[in-house]
Amino acid sequence: EEELQMIQPEKLLLVTVGKTATLHCTVTSLLPVGPVLWFRGVGPGRELIYNQKEGHFPRVTTVSDLTKRNNMDFSIRISSITPADVGTYYCVKFRKGSPENVEFKSGPGTEMALGAKPSAPVVLGPAARTTPEHTVSFTCESHGFSPRDITLKWFKNGNELSDFQTNVDPTGQSVAYSIRSTARVVLDPWDVRSQVICEVAHVTLQGDPLRGTANLSEAIRVPPTLEVTQQPMRVGNQVNVTCQVRKFYPQSLQLTWSENGNVCQRETASTLTENKDGTYNWTSWFLVNISDQRDDVVLTCQVKHDGQLAVSKRLALEVTVHQKDQSSDATP
């Protein structure tokens, strides 16, 4: 005859307040004859949780029909869990006796603990923008979870980050815990469209991690490159000079032209285009009048980007004698 085993498969059961907890218990034999009862705790002060034969247990239901002759499943469900329900639950087999039943065998017990989901991770980036090739730090915080075991990963786009430091507080016992992690990442010139992602995995999330994101567009400043060129073609007595401001971010930009050191107030034509990496190009055209009296014209394109120090590029205008002749010929 097979010896009776009481099987409680879960050593630990995490439950959330207000939900229903299922405590599993199966037996390997129908013998000896007698009931299976559920208790919380051990020893003389243990609390009766469920007895099929007597008592009223409004929050407890059985998973199987215990009245069935060959039933070997004595699992129960406890509804509307509260913090007062935590503890270790035992299913215990009694042998039928007279005048009263005698305890025969106990299961190993299932510890019911309150699990709390972590809050959605919040990712914060640096307070000020930084240029490519510099290191920036991002912090990720999530709160209110239990138990303490938690996994946090960092990604830049799809690639994991490896330079981070993570702390879970408090270190001792607590009803809820918080995690804070700081990741360091070097900015690439194309990071305007990049994202930093903090991913938190916890037993209460059933394999569906929570994610918090930060856009690197808020942390990066890509300084512009400037190029000033003189167009070979001219219109009447005017020469077209172009200032190309390339690959900058953010969009905030002020451009001024000056002629021989004097700032020009007149309107100039310009276009703004967005590159596929999220940076911008700005092209400004400046028309310079050519006359016999103007031998050495120095044009300066000055750009102030995102509140930084102004950068400028100069161009000494090349006006050939031939061009001057043409211009005087064309003048009525």
Epitope: F155, K156, N157, N159, E160, S162, D163, F164, V186, D188
Partner: antibody, heavy 124, light 113 residues
Framework: QVQLVQSGAEVKKPGASVKVSCKAS????????MHWVRQAPGQGLEWMGW????????GYAQKFQGRVTMTRDTSTSTVYMELSSLRSEDTAVYYC?????????????????WGQGTLVTVSS | DIVMTQSPDSLAVSLGERATINCKSS????????????LAWYQQKPGQPPKLLIY???TRESGVPDRFSGSGSGTDFTLTISSLQAEDVAVYYC?????????FGQGTKVEIK
């Protein structure tokens, strides 16, 4: 030249653990990520996880989470990969492989060079 | 996870002839902001560890003969051996490093016809 030398073959029983070592030479050990990749007999390559030898941080493929532990000893430029609760399906050649530079913080996942491999056989 | 599928599974080519191996990913490996494809190719000879041939889909690792070339973008990639040599008999793997977990193709075995 850059070299990764791994520990010798191991035979383990189901349920046991195995710890494979990988000693690096020819470069600054803490400057590059280290990865572990395994290959079951006659099968393809399977990435297991990474380690940052500078910080000691690790990241594991979901499949191995909870069973794999990667550690390092910077004094000997050695990384270790421990796999627990072994089963017959874990019989494979385990490779360490150097990844990208640590300095940028991002794990660039091409691998060069590779260790010679360590055969782990799980059998009762 | 990104799934990498190679074709064919095996390939028999005459010495001096061209060998072409294809690799398809379940999602694009092109990061448009830097115009790079996050794909590598490896060669593995019997009893040896894999050896890096190509990274960024088309950049040849130093010391790799120029008969090996990588091409393709997005989800479709090709490794070409322009003139097969006896020492090229091996299994070739593609691998994505666009996002973790980093995954490999199932491998293509190249033999001499």
């Amino acid at each position: 030249q850059v070299q990764l030398v791994q520990s010798g073959a191991e035979v383990k029983k189901p349920g046991a653990s195995v710890k494979v070592s990988c000693k690096a030479s020819g470069y600054t050990f803490t400057s590059y990520h280290m990865h572990w990749v395994r290959q079951a007999p006659g099968q393809g390559l399977e990435w297991m996880g990474w380690m940052n030898p500078n910080s000691g941080n690790t990241g594991y493929a979901q499949k191995f989470q909870g069973r794999v532990t990667m550690t390092r000893d910077t004094s000997t430029s050695t990384v270790y990969m421990e796999l627990s609760s072994l089963r017959s399906e874990d019989t494979a050649v385990y490779y360490c492989a150097r990844g990208g530079r640590v300095v940028r913080g991002v794990i660039k996942g091409w691998f060069d060079p590779w260790g010679q491999g360590t055969l782990v056989t799980v059998s009762s | 996870d990104i799934v990498m599928t190679q074709s064919p599974d095996s390939l028999a080519v005459s010495l001096g002839e061209r060998a072409t191996i294809n690799c398809k990913s379940s999602q694009s490996l092109l990061y448009t902001s830097n115009d790079r494809n996050y794909l590598a190719w490896y060669q593995q000879k019997p009893g040896q560890p894999p050896k890096l041939l190509i990274y960024w889909a088309s950049t040849r690792e130093s010391g790799v003969p120029d008969r090996f070339s990588g091409s393709g973008s997005g989800t479709d990639f090709t490794l070409t051996i322009s003139s097969l040599q006896a020492e090229d008999v091996a299994v070739y793997y593609c691998q994505q490093y666009y996002s973790s977990p980093y995954t490999f193709g199932q491998g293509t075995k190249v033999e001499i016809k």
